[in-house]
Amino acid sequence: KAMHVAQPAVVLANSRGTASFVCEYASPGKATEVRVTVLRQADSQVTEVCAATYMMGNELTFLDDSICTGTSSGNQVNLTIQGLRAMDTGLYICKVELMYPPPYYMGIGNGTQIYVIDPEPCPDSD
């Protein structure tokens, strides 16, 4: 009855500092309300990057000031994190919670290692 969450092991952010990955979960129940949270693990510290709650069949809505956007399709969530810099390289964990109806279930993925490379500054042209 445990909920399994799958996500890619590695993703490379693009030159604009945007990284996208899919978070897929095997639902043990028929949830109508789902919460998806992206966590960042650095050393042994875990911090929340962003979170969104959505009703099945509806779009994910992150807060206006969130660095995340996303879309959902069935038991799959497509997540995009923007504004990343080299210092943000790290392990990003997808947590899925089936909020309603009871019982509550939680699933945590193994994490996606996101590599971010800051773009080289353009050389001055004479």
Epitope: K1, A2, E33, V46, E48, K95, E97, M99, Y104, G107
Partner: antibody, heavy 118, light 108 residues
């Protein structure tokens, strides 16, 4: 520092009501699920109830369903447990606990004692 | 509901000895959602291990967790005087969140 402080315990007669509070500080309260866990004298830990994030979702143990109500005020960083129709078997130390980002209960209050006796 | 059983009920050991505590689940529990707590008399429980094997912040490395499926173990490699307490396992992957009955580690 991160802290949870319970209050509101005491001695109450069977059938009466009591409301417990748990004041949170040192973290972004609205970002965490919050639990009540109880421990009868000399016994083990029993999960009582949880309330998630904005307060719209709550889950209860069968032993308290229909009698206890969990709520939260995110503007006051406070968690509550309204206990109605109290029974002798509800006598316990009641702890509030934070549901950590990874799921386990990572921060606990010091507990407040509730005694139901005539 | 997932029922957790702990054994032994009491473990009598001396400081410096190794303690091995067992937690068995009535149905399979993902190792990601199994925790261990320590509780001393008159105190609140303290999180030791989450995800079956990850130490919580500030927990010394003499505490380690292992296991999967229905069988989990908490090991204290060398008991210190402050380790004599009651230990609870818990599953937190689904509601109702359940605790084991506890194992008391006392001084022989």
């Amino acid at each position: 520092q991160v802290q949870l402080v319970e209050s509101g315990g005491g001695v109450v007669q069977p059938g009466r009501s009591l409301r417990l509070s748990c004041a949170a500080s040192g973290f972004t309260f609205r970002s965490y699920g919050m639990h009540w866990v109880r421990q009868a004298p000399g016994k083990g830990l029993e999960w009582v109830a949880v309330i998630w994030y904005d307060g719209s979702n709550k889950h209860y143990a069968d032993s308290v369903k229909g009698r206890f109500t969990i709520s939260r005020d995110n503007s006051k960083n406070t968690l509550y447990l309204q206990m109605n129709s109290l029974r002798a078997e509800d006598t316990a130390v009641y702890y509030c606990a934070r549901n950590g980002l990874i799921g386990a209960f990572d921060i606990w209050g010091q507990g407040t004692m509730v005694t139901v006796s005539s | 509901e997932i029922v957790l059983t702990q054994s032994p009920g009491t473990l009598s050991l001396s400081p410096g000895e190794r303690a091995t505590l067992s937690c068995r689940a009535s149905q399979s529990v993902s190792s990601s959602y199994l925790a261990w707590y320590q509780q001393k008399p008159g105190q609140a429980p303290r999180l030791l291990i989450y995800g079956a094997s990850s130490r919580a912040t500030g927990i010394p490395d003499r505490f380690s967790g292992s296991g999967s499926g229905t069988d989990f173990t908490l090991t204290i490699s060398r008991l210190e005087p402050e380790d004599f307490a009651v230990y609870y396992c818990q599953q937190y992957g689904s509601s109702p969140f359940t605790f084991g009955p506890g194992t008391k580690v006392d001084i022989k």
